[in-house]
Amino acid sequence: APVPPGEDSKDVAAPHRQPLTSSERIDKQIRYILDGISALRKETCNKSNMCESSKEALAENNLNLPKMAEKDGCFQSGFNEETCLVKIITGLLEFEVYLEYLQNRFESSEEQARAVQMSTKVLIQFLQKKAKNLDAITTPDPTTNASLLTKLQAQNQWLQDMTTHLILRSFKEFLQSSLRALRQM
């Protein structure tokens, strides 16, 4: 790669590197999102005692957050690359409505919440390029998502705080499982 013109000693181009592979870039993207989730969790846990609460089951009834199961082929036992990739993409698409819900839930981390949402969209694009069997991926129904969003936003303050905490925790767990599975692909 040509060094750009007009270089001076304090402003030199980075050394030439091997281009990023699809797997490397997806790995970095997931870690980027996980760092974002950590930043958001920090604000959530500082603002309320949700992170230590034992009443999670009350809020969890309202949520249908994506989870990895044995049948999804993402665990070491019964690992199936194609089935797992479909599950990861489908799960991320299902999380999008919950990430939309998070957008108005943060005061000092508004920009970070937006970054997590947008970087998830990018991750989905990267993974869709990798997937061979795109027909097997079911996209959530927009009408169902819209009514879910309305329902979540109508909850009382305590439930909204708990929902925020649960979304972040579940999303973190889903991404961690995805990261482990993708490293086997």
Partner: nanobody
Framework: QLQLVESGGGLVQPGGSLGLSCAAS????????IGWFRQAPGKEREGVAC????????YYADSVKGRFTISRDNAKDTVYLQMNSLKPEDTAVYYC????????????????????????WGQGTQVTVSS
Amino acid sequence: QLQLVESGGGLVQPGGSLGLSCAASGFTLAYYGIGWFRQAPGKEREGVACISSSDLSTYYADSVKGRFTISRDNAKDTVYLQMNSLKPEDTAVYYCAAGTWDLKFGYSRSNCVRSYEYDYWGQGTQVTVSS
């Protein structure tokens, strides 16, 4: 061979518009943060705009804010710089560059206009604003 290719430069009248494109060969542009730089004769190179690959956020130098728009189409693996309300002082060779400045959450967006953040550079396309 790994290279970036800019296109869309040309001669335009003051107040006019021009759209530049940046494409890559030998690697995937969608995986990199992209910056547009420019260099006028006898002047130092300056970063004008950049766009993240991680969260698609953008940054603009004050000199082009409100007039230039950077965007990317990951499906086409192309980055664009739409330039409106062009002024004679926008005359320069425009370069696109690809780097990994955006892979850490919480990166400082304004750093993206520093050339040391970039690994790959194009050969440039001439933009002339004159009546």
